[in-house]
Interface confidence: low
């Protein structure tokens, strides 16, 4: 599914990631354009071997199994293909558990070099939330 | 349970392209990854990629690059498999498996002969 | 790419002996290692995934051991149901690479 910006806040403001952690909402809608441009089955392979998943591009070396990286945590004990659905509950509620990790959302490098110290509050300007 | 249903045997003229197909049933076809894998007599199995069908994402082992293309259709629940350019050396049984790192499910295989 | 190299290449038993196939690895692939049987026009089926762990549905009489470069399948009691090839695969890397196969054959 290929989330559209407003109906993306609204389901991230719904699973409580308004202001989680201290992040307002425009921080994590910022990070899922620029980490899958709001595709829940976005894939990408990294050179260490593990691939990110889904809307929030989460990281199988550490967060999620999917059987095929070598030396995988799976922190959020959670199979890497929860991540691929149309349904975000299970990345939401591993994006929790990174951010509560100590580095904040900077665990996200596309948040990092593309929302951080940014206006992120327009990534939810003019929503109906 | 979980299925892969592979088409059927081919001859092809060296030259021609051929397209193989491997239905999947059983499982949410779009997220897990198909693996293709070639086995020829004396060559045991060779790994030729994936694709995860929900997102269209592929990869190919270098050695296949340019001959094989991936692609899936997620209405109906199959991948296929294009060889191009076909030579004797692409003679062989061509496997469809479901990828979790190792493949417990396996198609039946498509036999492709060129000559 | 990493290379698996199998051995014996052929090896001829009696049904009821026990066997050790070998696989070996040109670099270190922790424990990310599997065992295939295949029968004659048949695919490939797994037999154990992850050096030892076995799959549901096979005999207890096959297992595997090993770690980083040197992996070992056991088969305890041959039975006639058991001849055929077996390979091994690595998924500690892309591209994934199978072993050359050992086929097990009837003295």
């Known amino acids: 599914k290929v989330f559209g910006r407003c109906e993306l806040a609204a389901a991230m403001k719904r699973h409580g990631l308004d202001n989680y952690r201290g992040y307002s909402l425009g921080n994590w809608v910022c990070a899922a354009k620029f980490e899958s441009n709001f595709n829940t089955q976005a894939t990408n392979r990294n050179t260490d071997g593990s691939t990110d998943y889904g809307i929030l591009q989460i990281n199988s070396r550490w967060w999620c199994n999917d059987g095929r990286t070598p030396g995988s945590r799976n922190l959020c004990n959670i199979p890497c293909s929860a991540l691929l659905s149309s349904d975000i509950t299970a990345s939401v509620n591993c994006a929790k558990k990174i951010v509560s990790d100590g580095n904040g959302m900077n665990a996200w490098v596309a948040w990092r070099n593309r929302c951080k110290g940014t206006d992120v509050q327009a990534w939810i300007r003019g929503c109906r939330l | 349970q979980v299925q892969l249903q592979e088409s059927g045997a081919e001859v092809m003229k060296p030259g021609a392209s051929v397209k193989i197909s491997c239905k999947a049933t059983?499982?949410?076809?779009?997220?897990?990854?198909i693996e293709w894998v070639k086995q020829r007599p004396g060559h045991g199995l060779e790994w030729i990629g994936e694709?995860?069908?929900?997102?269209?994402?592929?990869y190919y082992n270098e050695k296949f690059k340019g001959k094989a293309t991936f692609t899936a259709d997620t209405s109906s629940n199959t991948a296929y498999m294009q060889l191009s350019s076909l030579t004797s050396e692409d003679s062989a049984v061509y496997y469809c498996?479901?990828?979790?790192?190792?493949?417990?499910?396996w198609g039946q295989g498509t036999t492709l002969t060129v000559s | 790419d990493i290379e698996l190299t199998q051995s014996p290449a052929t090896l001829s038993v009696t049904p009821g002996d026990s066997v050790s196939l070998s696989c070996r690895a040109s670099?270190?692939?922790?424990?990310?290692l599997h065992w295939y049987q295949q029968k004659s026009h048949e695919s490939p089926r797994l037999l154990i995934k992850?050096?030892?762990q076995s799959m549901s549905g096979i005999p207890s009489r096959f297992s595997g051991s090993g770690s980083g470069t040197d992996f070992t399948l056991s088969i305890n009691s041959v039975e006639t149901e058991d001849f055929g090839m077996y390979f091994c695969?690595?998924?500690?890397?892309?591209?994934?690479?199978f072993g050359g196969g050992t086929k097990l054959e009837i003295k």
């Open positions: 992850y050096t030892s």
């Open positions: 694709i995860l069908p929900g997102s269209g994402s592929t």
């Open positions: 695969q690595q998924s500690n890397s892309w591209p994934r690479t």
């Open positions: 670099q270190s692939i922790s424990n990310n």
């Open positions: 059983g499982y949410t076809f779009t997220t897990y990854w």
């Open positions: 498996a479901r990828g979790d790192g190792h493949y417990y499910y």
